[in-house]
Amino acid sequence: CKAMHVAQPAVVLASSRGIASFVCEYASPGKATEVRVTVLRQADSQVTEVCAATYMMGNELTFLDDSICTGTSSGNQVNLTIQGLRAMDTGLYICKVELMYPPPYYLGIGNGTQIYVIDPEPCPDSDF
């Protein structure tokens, strides 16, 4: 397993609809043809996989399991969008990138993006 640098923004604020987007960029040491990207949420000491996708270079991302994420890839960048976030989902979202093929296998883990989610205030009753 060889190490690889992964960059991601330090802070992102989710929209009022609970949507947060960020870019995960990796320094590919070679010409990878198959990549797996995983987003991990770290809150307190617990780490949970939020979403994961595999893709062949130039193709669309195929997300695994009951994913709340969407995304696109462009070169060594993956644009990720997480939906359905609530205030309780505020936390550190870490991007993990694996270059699966061809060998050798490379693994890179970003420092994380702190995503802040603020639940929208309910609209006050209107007399109109």
């Epitope: 797996r36 995983t38 617990q46 780490v47 949970t48 996989e49 979403c51 994961a52 595999t54 195929t62 997300f63 695994l64 399991d65 009951d66 994913s67 709340i68 939906q83 359905g84 694996e98 699966m100 093929y101 296998y105």
Partner: antibody, heavy 119, light 107 residues
Framework: QVQLVQSGAEVKMSGASVRVSCKAS????????ISWMRQAPGQGLEWMGW????????NYAQKLQGRVTMTTDTSTGTAYMELRSLTSDDTAVYYC????????????WGQGTLVTVSS | DIQMTQSPSSLSASVGDRVTITCRAS??????LNWYQQKPGKAPNLLIY???SLQSGVPSRFSGSGSGTDFTLTISSLQPEDFATYYC?????????FGGGTKVEIK
């Protein structure tokens, strides 16, 4: 604690449809999706697909595309799997399952629902 | 789709034996490999996830190893309650796929 309780056994005629329910409890239903697996008598496990409870997005196994529909009712915390145009090959125990902290890993399973298709 | 091949398909062993089951993926899946135990008439029970992590509540006589394409489930000292069928499953990519199963029977 997390519990998944499935509907009872069904006997169906060939060509008919079946709907299996999976009632979830012990967690916030929309925080996790539900996956469905099946197991023919004496055979191995087959992944059928999953549904994201939060937004209703679904992803089905290619061989079942067009015949299977997975839905959720967030008001009752229940997931449903409907399979149409049944044949004897669809005779199986159908399971719903939920992931834990890791994607595609299933610590939580329903008890199973036997669907028998007779011709 | 990723094919998962388990071997052997069945084995006979005695209480106290060390049992090893192997699982091979048709392509590299890193450590995204899980093991389940299933008893007749019951749902599968998760034993090992991500190749080597022991699921909470599972006895320590169960262990998993491997990465890439080749994986192993080991039962260090077989107990009467361990006679069951064991399945591997990859969680690397969709569609999720299972091995054909290994039935562990009493010798």
């Amino acid at each position: 604690q997390v519990q998944l309780v499935q509907s009872g056994a069904e006997v169906k005629m060939s060509g008919a449809s079946v709907r299996v329910s999976c009632k979830a409890s012990g967690y916030t239903f929309t925080s996790y999706g539900i996956s469905w697996m099946r197991q023919a008598p004496g055979q191995g496990l087959e992944w059928m697909g999953w549904i994201t409870a939060y937004n209703g997005n679904s992803n089905y196994a290619q061989k079942l595309q067009g015949r299977v529909t997975m839905t959720t009712d967030t008001s009752t915390g229940t997931a449903y799997m409907e399979l149409r145009s049944l044949t004897s090959d669809d005779t199986a125990v159908y399971y719903c399952a939920r992931r834990g902290d890791y994607l595609g890993v299933f610590p939580y399973w329903g008890q199973g629902t036997l669907v028998t298709v007779s011709s | 789709d990723i094919q998962m091949t388990q071997s052997p398909s069945s084995l006979s062993a005695s209480v106290g034996d060390r049992v090893t089951i192997t699982c091979r993926a048709s392509q590299s899946i890193s450590s995204y490999l899980n093991w389940y135990q299933q008893k007749p008439g019951k749902a599968p029970n998760l034993l090992i996830y991500t190749a080597s992590s022991l699921q909470s509540g599972v006895p320590s006589r169960f262990s998993g190893s491997g990465s890439g394409t080749d994986f192993t489930l080991t039962i260090s000292s077989l107990q009467p309650e361990d006679f069951a069928t064991y399945y591997c499953q990859q969680s690397y990519s969709s569609p999720l796929t299972f091995g054909g199963g290994t039935k562990v029977e009493i010798k």
